[in-house]
């Protein structure tokens, strides 16, 4: 049971990419406001986004404290202008979110090719190590810092003059591939966490091609 003229939130959904994590829900409020609480399975509830008319709440600051923990959130509904009002059970109406484990569930953001350098018949392709909002010792960790060897990159590459693609993998952020001399190549990368069963892959990076600004060519 809940407060008269308030409705419980529903469709609570976690939206998370590279640990930037937002809880979304419905409905758009009419004469009501929301407050969100978040907790680990064993921890205390912490309130966020107090008395908001938004239908989303950024919980990044809470989940980055320990991305391997499992979190639960709940959204409380209050009548607008009367937030002290409670239901007959003595507490406001609320709805629980699904459980969320950031390390296992955050989506991998679209990677970016930082650079490529050709030396003779080898090309070194470097993937940008994207910064996350996860902190350790007051510094922000990169995606590689957080996932370590759990994160691999798949490189797709092809001659500019042909559509036949090849692929290679790395568990660092660098590839060293063989190419044909005198040919221009295009590159795209995808981030993958092979040990996951869902949300294993990112979208592909933008395509970068030799002969454009990003790379460097050295004939040895």
């Amino acid at each position: 049971s809940g407060t008269t003229n308030t409705v419980a939130a529903y469709n609570l959904t976690w939206k998370s990419t590279n640990f930037k994590t937002i809880l979304e829900w419905e409905p758009k409020p009419v004469n009501q406001v929301y407050t969100v609480q978040i907790s680990t399975k064993s921890g205390d509830w912490k309130s966020k986004c107090f008395y908001t008319t938004d239908t989303e709440c950024d919980l990044t600051d809470e989940i980055v404290k320990d991305v391997k923990q499992t979190y639960l959130a709940r959204v409380f509904s209050y009548p607008a202008g009367n937030v002290e009002s409670t239901g007959s059970a003595g507490e406001p109406l609320y709805e629980n979110s699904p459980e969320f484990t950031p390390y296992l569930e955050t989506n991998l953001g679209q990677p970016t090719i930082q650079s490529f350098e050709q030396v003779g018949t080898k090309v070194n392709v470097t993937v940008e190590d994207e910064r996350t909002l996860v902190r350790r010792n007051n510094t922000f960790l990169s995606l590689r810092d957080v996932f370590g060897k759990d994160l691999i990159y798949t490189l797709y590459y092809w001659k500019s003059s042909s559509s036949g693609k090849k692929t290679a993998k790395t568990n660092t952020n660098e590839f060293l591939i063989d190419v044909d001399k005198g040919e221009n190549y295009c590159f795209s990368v995808q981030a993958v966490i092979p040990s996951r069963t869902v949300n294993r892959k990112s979208t592909d990076s933008p395509v970068e091609c030799m002969g454009q600004e990003k790379g460097e060519f050295r004939e040895i």
């Epitope: 090849k166 290679a168 993998k169 591939i177 995808q190 092979p194 294993r200 592909d204």
Partner: antibody
Amino acid sequence: QIQLVQSGPEVVKPGASVRVSCKGSGYSFTDYNIYWVRQSPAKGLEWIGYIDPYNGLTIYDQNFRAKATLSVDHSTSNAYMEINSLRYEDTAVYFCARDVTSALEFWGQGTSVTVSS
Amino acid sequence: DIQMTQSPASISASVGERVTITCLGSQTIDTYLAWYLQKPGRSPQLLIYAATQLADGVPSRFSASGSGTDFSLTISSLQPEDVATYYCQNVYSSPFTFGQGNKLEIK
């Protein structure tokens, strides 16, 4: 449990085409690449290519680029390989397999394709 | 393209014996190597991934080592059910080539 179930055996004439299907179940179909491999007594295991159901991207061994076409149907969790311009030496057992941590963890039961006039 | 060469092509060993087969890559592939076994009339079955990691359900008598270009698979105590053909596979870069196989028989 995770399964890949392939279509039944085929006997086809030289020059014809054949389509082999591979139905995935028990897992999130778009999250894992589907690889295709063939096996014949003469050449052993040959890697044909793979398709990433997530984005439709295909990678082929250059020897099969003009021979095989890979596709998926998300609505039925089916992967397909069409082999065209069949020759006697294309007689083989064709396998689909699902990737995991840099390997092929689950395999279909194989589809025998016999090219015979 | 990376070629994978396995040796010996066939092995005959006694039950309880220690058996080692090797796989040599024509270029370095770090630890991106897989081992499979295949019994007659069956699909290949994953034994080892990432050069050294046992796949789920694989008995502990199997072990593997190597990185770069040189890899090996060892059965510490051969069992009758280990009769099969063993294949290595480059899973580093396409084409993801297989070795030609090692056929293992019981003496």
